[in-house]
Interface confidence: low
């Protein structure tokens, strides 16, 4: 019988008392085969973190800063359940750390040096860790002790809880730096009052502070937010203008064998029985013998954290960067205009080989980072382990939802002004063998399908989106008798046709022979009835253009396209017989690396782009023997996006809508995780 006990960690006598009450009340409402609570008492949160890591306890609720500590080795804990606040109808699991200024003050985020600052308190998330972490690399050397560097950066401050004797400038705006509400400038409201009174020029608070302190919109309109891109926005636009998005209070558990499903089952049942306004006898979100015992008193309930989320992703790139700067004394970017090397994310072995060759040829401008799947790469770009990669439109959508931005587009047509003219896109097509003459778009049920990969544009999002509109359910593995759609569940019929060996079977990378455009076409040639690819795939792999044994004798005339009206046409008539127009692949990065990625890639393509005529003796960025490694092999250049610089603008309304409709069929654990942070 599996042990269904969750050992909760308590950090004080009062918490231990509440924990025992929690345990006893859960026993009274949950059947004996359900989850139960046991209580473990430790002296501090850090002791609880260590106890969970050592398997002496299972769960504890932590503030954001401690979630970061819990995540660090050797603890390796992960967030599993989030408290939410506000109403059930609009539950808030995060708050936004913001920099508030007066409307007429005229400076930006990059002009804070010499200004007067108001902080909620030394060492607090929104008031200190985040702003100072983000400003860390602008602080004057030496940066240690940190308080001295901050004192020398601003012309005066109020940082409650600082040592006024050693660092008097930090207490200049609030003599004594009192660490309680006796100091009128202490805490969120105090820091805002410090700005309002004219003592300071900027207040570092959370997004709700200004609304809690100024009920009148006309009064709020006298203030603005400083954004990280050195612009300002109105105070109600905090979702698009904040320093970091910070989780409020989170239950953590072990990453491996952490009982996360059991913890959720326990807390979900607990909130049903003892949540807000549920029971008089015991209340989960109330602390008669103290404040915020086990859970915050202001919490309204729990939400399950998506399993794909580790602490870094949960906390978010901005917050992790801020904390790491303070803890490790490292700067995330060079403080000059010079760009650091771009860390390119390479998928599996084949891409890594090409990337390493690129890195050597770039003389230090490009470095390589490996991952096994596209989603793993996107996650690494999000958390700063990598910087950029080129993605199919389906993954541009996921990357965009995860906060990344497109920076350059692959162009596939030769033109005089390639780099200045991003193309409208390519065509997604359905290819069949000419010999299967009875096959049409209308009778694909029960046939064998070949896809580039789950989540990709031509191979999945477009054909499956069209199919979904016909069948109105997500069970595509029942619609086709079998197929190869790399990235599907391994036991799915959509992995049955795949050719990868062992663990590589159906993997969404080049270790699976039927992955990508060429792989999906090969799947059709060898096993399938229909392949969902791009309009250039057939000509690129027939007529001797692909020398691989499976392709060298293929003839374009032996294949036809399925049209949506139920007819078929020759391959060259793709313009009148396609499923949809697909956005070109694009390079994505984090917003903070956008300028450098743009600059370095444009230099790189001038050196190694399609102007290189002999690829046998020289490195060619856009060549890999039809394997589409790092970039599509038919890329002519990487083009500027001009104003199409967000994922919505780049992909276009129609495609975003199509992928949005397919969201309910999404198998993307990353998309699930990213929409938790920003729905």
């Amino acid at each position: 019988v599996p042990d269904k006990t969750v050992r909760w960690c308590a950090v004080s006598e009062h918490e231990a008392t509440k924990c025992q009450s929690f345990r006893d009340h859960m026993k009274s409402v949950i059947p004996s085969d359900g989850p139960s609570v046991a209580c473990v008492k430790k002296a501090s949160y850090l002791d609880c973190i260590r106890a969970i890591a050592a398997n002496e306890a299972d769960a504890v609720t932590l503030d954001a800063g401690l979630v970061y500590d819990a995540y660090l080795a050797p603890n390796n804990l992960k967030p599993v359940v989030a408290e939410f606040y506000g109403s059930k109808e609009d539950p808030q699991t995060f708050y936004y750390a913001v920099a508030v200024v007066k409307k007429d003050s005229g400076f930006q985020m990059n002009q804070l040096r010499g200004k007067k600052s108001c902080h909620t308190g030394l060492g607090r998330s929104a008031g200190w860790n985040i702003p100072i972490g983000l400003l860390y690399c602008d602080l004057p050397e030496p940066r240690k002790p940190l308080e001295k560097a901050v004192a020398n950066f601003f012309s005066g401050s109020c940082a409650p809880c600082a040592d006024g004797t050693d660092f008097p400038q930090l207490c200049q705006l609030c003599p004594g730096c009192g660490c309680s509400t006796l100091n009128q400038y202490f805490g969120y409201s105090g820091a805002f009052k410090c700005l309002k009174d004219g003592a300071g020029d900027v207040a570092f608070v959370k997004h709700s502070t200004i609304f809690e302190n100024l009920a009148n919109k006309a009064d709020r309109d006298q203030y603005e937010l400083l954004c990280l891109d050195n612009t300002r926005k109105p105070v109600d636009e905090y979702k698009d203008c904040h320093l970091a998005q910070v989780p409020s209070h989170t239950v953590v558990a072990r990453s491996m064998g952490g009982k996360e499903d059991l913890i959720w089952e326990l807390l979900n049942q607990a909130q049903e029985h003892f949540g807000k306004d549920k029971s008089k006898e015991f209340q989960l979100f109330s602390s008669p013998h103290g404040k915020d015992l086990l859970f915050k008193d202001s919490a309204h309930g729990f939400l399950k954290v998506p399993p794909r989320m580790d602490a870094k992703m949960y906390l978010g790139y901005e917050y992790v960067t801020a904390i790491r700067n303070l803890r490790e004394g490292t700067c995330p970017e060079a403080p000059t205009d010079e760009c650091k090397p771009v860390k390119w994310c390479a998928l599996s072995h084949h891409e890594r080989l090409k990337c390493d060759e690129w890195s050597v040829n770039s003389v230090g401008k490009i470095e390589c980072v490996s991952a096994e799947t596209t989603e793993d790469c996107i996650a690494k770009i999000m958390n700063g382990e990598a910087d950029a990669m080129s993605l199919d439109g389906g993954f541009v959508y996921i990357a965009g939802k995860c906060g990344l931005v497109p920076v350059l587009a692959e162009n596939y047509n030769k033109s005089d002004n390639c780099e200045d003219t991003p193309e409208a896109g390519y065509f997604a097509i359905a290819v069949v063998k000419k010999s299967a003459s009875d096959l049409t778009w209308d009778n694909l049920k029960g046939k064998k399908s070949c896809h580039t990969a789950v989540g990709r544009t031509a191979g999945w999002n477009i054909p499956m989106g069209l199919l979904y509109n016909k069948i109105n359910h997500c069970r595509f593995d029942e619609f086709f008798s079998e197929g190869c759609a790399p990235g599907s569940k391994k036991d799915s019929s959509l992995c049955k046709l795949c050719m990868g060996s062992g663990l590589n079977l159906c993997e969404p990378n080049n270790k699976e022979g039927y992955y990508g455009y060429t792989g999906a076409f090969r799947c059709l040639v060898e096993k399938g009835d229909v392949a969902f690819v791009k309009h250039q795939t057939v000509p690129q792999n027939t007529g001797g253009k692909n020398p691989d044994p499976w392709a060298k004798n293929l003839n374009e005339k032996d294949y036809e396209l399925l049209c949506l009206d139920g007819t078929r046409k020759p391959v060259e008539e793709y313009a009148n017989c396609h499923l949809a127009r697909a956005p070109n692949h694009a390079v994505v990065t984090r917003k903070d690396k956008e300028a450098c990625v743009h600059k370095i890639l444009r230099q790189q393509q001038h050196l190694f782009g399609s102007n290189v005529t002999d690829c046998s003796g020289n490195f060619c960025l856009f060549r890999s023997e039809t394997k589409d490694l790092l970039f599509r092999d038919d890329t002519v250049c990487l083009a500027k996006l001009h104003d199409r610089n967000t994922y919505e603008k780049y992909l276009g309304e129609e495609y975003v809508k199509a992928v949005g409709n397919l969201r309910k069929c999404s198998t993307s654990s990353l998309l699930e995780a990213c929409t938790f942070r920003r729905p």
Epitope: F84, K88, E89, D90, P91, G301, L303, P306, V454, H473, C474, R475, F476, D477, A485, S488, K489, S492, L494, K657, G660, N661, R663, K664, C665, S666, T667, E672, T675, F676, P679
Partner: nanobody
Framework: QVKLEESGGGLVQAGGSLRLSCEAS????????MGWFRQAPGKERELVAG???????NYADSVKGRFTISRDNAQNTMYLQMNSLRPEDTAAYSC??????????????????WGQGTQVTVSS
């Protein structure tokens, strides 16, 4: 958890109109899309219309031009305005909500929620 409650069904003459409502409660924050399904006796359940939180919609061919789906996010309510009703529209209509981390290929319904259903009968 998400709870869904339908209302508005009933008996109506062919050519008449009805408006169905579906009110969501609970963790409504997690909802990515909602839909109306129907099942006539002896037939498979079919999607009538669907709407995402962003407002994009899709309809079954048989109801296009006659039915309109809409959503009031502030009230956590979805509506189905049914005009020019036909006898073949007679069925039990159910409201469906899918959360943002739902539905793997092959169909895990762990985060898919259904209402109890409301009967619509169209007499000729």
């Amino acid at each position: 958890q998400v709870k869904l409650e339908e209302s508005g069904g009933g008996l109506v003459q062919a050519g008449g109109s009805l408006r169905l409502s579906c009110e969501a409660s609970g963790n409504v924050f997690t909802i990515a899309a909602m839909g109306w399904f129907r099942q006539a006796p002896g037939k498979e359940r079919e999607l009538v219309a669907g709407i995402t939180t962003g407002g994009s919609t899709n309809y079954a061919d048989s109801v296009k031009g006659r039915f309109t789906i809409s959503r009031d996010n502030a009230q956590n309510t979805m509506y189905l305005q049914m005009n020019s009703l036909r006898p073949e529209d007679t069925a039990a209509y159910s409201c469906n909500a899918v959360t943002k981390w739902a539905a793997r290929v092959g169909g895990s319904a762990e985060y898919e929620y259904w209402g109890q259903g409301t009967q619509v009968t169209v007499s000729s």
